[in-house]
């Protein structure tokens, strides 16, 4: 069964401060007012949930206070930012979108964004 289409960039490079941003866009087959967005990380064959937010169309995404994710929404686009990334967090980050309300329920899963994180070199001590 053809799932709801979700598009996300193939590759993103995190900033030197360990911040990565990407857009997750979905083709809504319905008239959803409540949408759930989940970021999953796939490493080898293991899948873990990075963060999740439910939002009402036209409103802001609300992640939990201790979440490493923030985001904004505009129509069928979600701008996601993941913070506090380190080199060991390099991996495939998958955007999952669920249209929760009103029914019918739809689910779509992106192909994933490969996020590369390079730890910054420590600054050498400087003598003045």
């Amino acid at each position: 069964c053809k799932a709801m289409h979700v598009a996300q960039p193939a590759v993103v490079l995190a900033s030197s401060r360990g911040i990565a941003s990407f857009v997750c866009e979905y083709a809504s087959p319905g008239k959803a007012t409540e949408v759930r967005v989940t970021v999953l990380r796939q490493a080898d064959s293991q899948v873990t949930e990075v963060c999740a937010a439910t939002y009402m169309m036209g409103n802001e995404l609300t992640f939990l206070d201790d979440s490493i994710c923030t985001g904004t929404s505009s129509g069928n686009q979600v701008n996601l930012t993941i913070q506090g990334l380190r080199a060991m967090d390099t991996g495939l980050y998958i955007c999952k979108v669920e249209l929760m309300y009103p029914p019918p329920y739809y689910l779509g899963i992106g192909n994933g964004t490969q996020i590369y994180v390079i730890d910054p070199e420590p600054c050498p001590d400087s003598d003045f």
Epitope: C1, A3, M4, V47, I94, P103, P104, L107, I109
Partner: antibody
């Protein structure tokens, strides 16, 4: 109240075709896909495919692509499934169900028996 | 197609007990999984959608969990009315069902 009313049980001969129906009521017909599911005796469920009344688009399980044809009549809010070149392997209960990516209401099922 | 393997095939438990049914996918399905309940002589009913969401009208004694390849349906405080066959369903690609778990009361 959402209802999916199937056509009655049918007995058909091998090699023949049959068209079964599913009359939907109690909701906006074009808002939901109509899925069809096969339940063979003593076996698990098999998804056959869906048709989306809003656009007329459909998608099939590859296994049933040459066996089943799904159609809808929006004016009568009825979905149809035609099964062709029937064999004893096609004897089963066939359910229609509405949904997007979850089938939240199911009809009672139509029993199709293929026998000479 | 993605193969869904359900276990156990049958299960007998006492009223008030908690039981768990497992569903394994042959590849990652990222929570794209539904659970259905089919009582004897009735049509299947949606129980859990999207791995964790309880369908309207279903008892909160039912809960779903899992991510990746392994999924679980937990039934707490078992009732006689829970006697049924439970099916998991993958909703990625070609939809496929598990073989079913028949739950009986001791």
């Amino acid at each position: 109240e959402v209802q999916l009313q199937p056509s009655g049980p049918v007995l058909v001969k091998p090699g023949a075709s049959v068209k079964i129906s599913c009359k939907a009521s109690g909701y906006t017909f074009t808002d939901y896909k109509i899925h069809w599911v096969k339940q063979s005796h003593g076996k698990s469920l098999e998804w056959i495919g869906y048709i989306y009344p809003y656009s007329g688009s459909s998608d099939y399980n590859q296994k049933f692509k040459s066996k089943a044809t799904l159609t809808v009549d929006n004016s009568s809010t009825t979905a149809y499934m035609e099964l062709r070149s029937l064999t004893s392997e096609d004897s089963a209960v066939y359910y229609c169900a509405r949904g997007g990516d979850a089938m939240d209401y199911w009809g009672q099922g139509t029993a199709v028996t293929v026998s000479s | 197609d993605i193969l869904m393997t359900q276990s156990p095939a049958s299960l007998s438990a006492s009223v008030g007990e908690t039981v768990t049914i497992t569903c394994g996918a042959s590849e990652n399905i990222y929570g794209a999984l539904n659970w259905y309940q089919r009582k004897q002589g009735k049509s299947p009913q949606l129980l859990i959608y999207g791995a964790t969401n309880l369908a309207d009208g279903m008892s909160s004694r039912f809960s779903g969990s899992g991510l990746g390849r392994q999924y679980y349906l937990k039934i707490s405080s078992l009732h006689p009315d829970d006697v049924a066959t439970y099916f998991c369903q993958n909703i990625l690609g070609t939809w496929t069902f598990g073989g079913g778990t028949k739950l009986e009361i001791k």
